[in-house]
């Protein structure tokens, strides 16, 4: 039962994270939560950083600045892969949840 619950939590978290990405950066509250998660967990996107390409409100050469290894204003514009966290947040935060929930 515990494993089923854990998988359900992961699935919900994945869906919720992707939903929040769709609202980025239009919704300030959503943006600040996603930025905080990406910066704190050193991750970018749901599965990986390329998820941000699919977000209509984000230009194709951009990830949120919170994805950058060294966060500065505008660092996510025309980003270089070596300058950003490439790992996805669902897996990274999911690992933390599995240990702590």
């Amino acid at each position: 039962a515990g494993y089923v619950f854990r998988d359900k939590v992961m699935s919900e978290f994945n869906n919720n994270f992707r939903q929040q990405m769709e609202n980025y950066p239009k919704n300030n509250h959503t943006a600040s939560i996603l930025d905080r998660m990406q910066a704190d967990f050193k991750c970018c996107g749901a599965a990986n950083y390329t998820d941000w390409e699919k977000i209509p409100s984000m230009s194709k050469n951009r990830v949120p600045d919170s994805c950058c290894i060294n966060v500065t204003v505008g660092c996510g514009i025309n980003f270089n892969e070596k300058a950003i966290h490439k790992e996805g947040c669902v897996e990274k935060i999911g690992g933390w949840l599995r240990k702590n929930v």
């Epitope: 390409e53 230009s59 194709k60 050469n61 660092c75 025309n78 270089n80 892969e81 300058a83």
Partner: antibody
Framework: QVQLVESGGGLVKPGGSLRLSCAVS????????MNWIRQAPGKGLEWVSY????????YYADSVKGRFTISRDNAKNSLYLQMNGLRADDTAVYYC????????????WGQGTLVTVSS | DIQMTQSPSSLSASVGDRVTITCRAS??????LNWYQQKPGKAPRLLIY???NLQSGVPSRFSGGGSGTDFTLTISSLQPADFATYYC??????????FGQGTRLEIN
């Protein structure tokens, strides 16, 4: 020193194919995005395509989408452009170009290779 | 796509002159603007990146300015080696990278 050397250009008939190669040396290849940029005779510069460090991201100009394919081999320090369905307006010098990204500009260019599409 | 418009298209000047080329973007591009010099039969060479930063090895007589939509490239005292074609280029919205149409600098 940084070197980018293109090859594979030449004369081809409309509808034909060519594969351009670019051999790079003198820098850590995987630290950079790479681009193909072309220049028709007597004309300005036109961006064609780029590929990310790992090859995960690829984009193309509308004028070549569906006909050209960019790829890279990080083990061989090489960049490629497969060009199919070539048209007369693809005639140009094709440059292999290093891209540090952010606001740094295209800092190193190859010498270029001429592609001529004519019957 | 962001359009880049250079002016003038061509320019005649003499050695020692101060020359300014302008580049206008169709929308704000912050400082994501670069300048290149190209001589006949050669590949372009990066002069200025990030609107105002001098690329390593480029003479200090070249300078860049501007932000947002309006940018300038200035050559403080023209030298014989400076007669060439100059292009501006934006990388703020990429793809596609877009270039200006070029400014041909000729000897008067």
């Amino acid at each position: 020193q940084v070197q980018l050397v293109e090859s594979g250009g030449g004369l081809v008939k409309p509808g034909g194919s060519l594969r351009l190669s670019c051999a790079v040396s003198g820098f850590t290849y995987t630290d950079y995005f790479m681009n193909w940029i072309r220049q028709a005779p007597g004309k300005g510069l036109e961006w064609v395509s780029y590929i990310s460090n790992s090859g995960a991201i690829k984009y193309y100009a509308d004028s070549v989408k569906g006909r050209f394919t960019i790829s890279r081999d990080n083990a061989k320090n090489s960049l490629y452009l497969q060009m199919n369905g070539l048209r007369a307006d693809d005639t140009a010098v094709y440059y292999c170009v290093r891209d540090p990204r952010s606001y740094y500009g295209f800092d190193y260019w190859g010498q270029g290779t001429l592609v001529t599409v004519s019957s | 796509d962001i359009q880049m418009t250079q002016s003038p298209s061509s320019l005649s000047a003499s050695v020692g002159d101060r020359v300014t080329i302008t580049c206008r973007a169709s929308q704000s591009i912050s400082n994501f603007l670069n300048w290149y010099q190209q001589k006949p039969g050669k590949a372009p060479r990066l002069l200025i990146y990030g609107a105002s930063n001098l690329q390593s090895g480029v003479p200090s007589r070249f300078s860049g300015g501007g932000s947002g939509t309006d940018f300038t490239l200035t050559i403080s005292s023209l030298q014989p080696a400076d007669f060439a074609t100059y292009y501006c280029q934006q990388s703020f919205s990429n793809p596609p990278v877009t270039f200006g149409q070029g400014t041909r600098l000729e000897i008067n």
